[in-house]
Amino acid sequence: MMTGTIETTGNISAEKGGSIILQCHLSSTTAQVTQVNWEQQDQLLAICNADLGWHISPSFKDRVAPGPGLGLTLQSLTVNDTGEYFCIYHTYPDGTYTGRIFLEVLESSVAEHGARFQIP
């Protein structure tokens, strides 16, 4: 039975040209995390495998940095980065847990600063 829950940052905003940390947290389960996939809509951004480390998709290599932890840092944000992001936790023996984050990249310099994981 899957007892775990995924906590995410929910809806966040950031300024164009800035950076943001995407983070999810799996709790309430003793299952071992074997891999975390980060996806934007249907596009793979990165994989963090417990045995093989990080893999960043080539098309994002120059502006995605792994971490902190199992999180992902997006840099040099553009308006095109606006959209849904998913963290997909592969665990044993529970199976797969998925979390959703919506990122809005704003043109103006008055992006909300309430995002819990936002970095300057």
């Epitope: 906590e7 940390i21 947290h25 799996l26 709790s27 003793t30 995390v33 975390v36 963090c48 495998n49 417990a50 093989l52 480390g53 990080w54 893999h55 960043i56 290599k61 120059d62 995605v64 940095a65 792994p66 971490g67 902190p68 932890g69 199992l70 840092t73 994981f117």
Partner: antibody, heavy 117, light 107 residues
Framework: EFQLQQSGTVLARPGASVKMFCKAS????????MHWVKQRPGQGLEWIGA????????NYNQKFKGKAKLTAVTSASTAYMELNSLTNEDSAVYYC??????????WGQGASVTVSS | DIVLTQSPATLSVTPRNSVSLSCRAS??????LHWYQQKSHGSPRLLIK???QSISGIPSRFSGSGSGTDFTLSINSVETEDFGMYFC?????????FGGGTKLEIN
């Protein structure tokens, strides 16, 4: 087998610079952060910073910005840390460790730096 | 920066007894907490990742619990090889930080 092999003991004068290495083997060097940690005699662990060879991303402890410079040569699977303007406070054992998102699971044997005039 | 406070600084224990070591964070780090053991003149060794996840090769007598700001490393029936320093470390945000350590010594 995974291994992180660090430089040997270094004795340096105050004001000098030292550059130490951490040679990785047994895994894909570009897939893991390489962290550097300082430990003064009888003291705890202090995080200096980390370098990600996959795209040269870095993160530093603010305290060590300007003191430590982290680099790597991916073709040699070797990470480097340079410490400049050495003082007695820099006398310590320095560890490298790898992290792929799941804790620092492998550590080097440590490199001892002694600053003395 | 997130400050991790470990207590007690020193813990004296008789072999085969069980002990608990505490690590408290200055703000919530959710489950991004790892534990390390360091024996005299040795390198640190990862014991537990993400609060409670086990590490291959680490004896099952080591276990972890907690979330948010309060965490515990438990050693069920301490053995002589367990004596040394124990450190917690957070990976919730940069910069990563370590706790000051707990020294586990023979009573």
């Amino acid at each position: 087998e995974f291994q992180l092999q660090q430089s040997g003991t270094v004795l340096a004068r105050p004001g000098a610079s030292v550059k130490m290495f951490c040679k990785a083997s047994g895994y894909s060097f570009t897939r893991y952060w390489m962290h550097w940690v300082k430990q003064r005699p009888g003291q705890g662990l202090e995080w200096i910073g980390a370098f990600y060879p996959g795209n040269s991303a870095t993160n530093y402890n603010q305290k060590f910005k300007g003191k430590a410079k982290l680099t790597a040569v991916t073709s040699a699977s070797t990470a480097y840390m340079e410490l400049n303007s050495l003082t007695n406070e820099d006398s310590a054992v320095y560890y490298c460790s790898r992290e792929g998102g799941y804790g620092m699971d492998h550590w080097g044997q440590g490199a001892s730096v002694t600053v003395s005039s | 920066d997130i400050v991790l406070t470990q207590s007690p600084a020193t813990l004296s224990v008789t072999p085969r007894n069980s002990v608990s070591l505490s690590c408290r964070a200055s703000q919530s780090i959710r489950n991004n907490l790892h534990w390390y053991q360091q024996k005299s003149h040795g390198s640190p060794r990862l014991l537990i990742k993400y609060v409670s996840q086990s590490i291959s090769g680490i004896p099952s007598r080591f276990s972890g619990s907690g979330s948010g700001t309060d965490f515990t490393l438990s050693i069920n029936s301490v053995e002589t090889e367990d004596f040394g320093m124990y450190f917690c470390q957070q990976s919730n945000s940069w910069p990563y930080t370590f706790g000051g350590g707990t020294k586990l010594e023979i009573n």
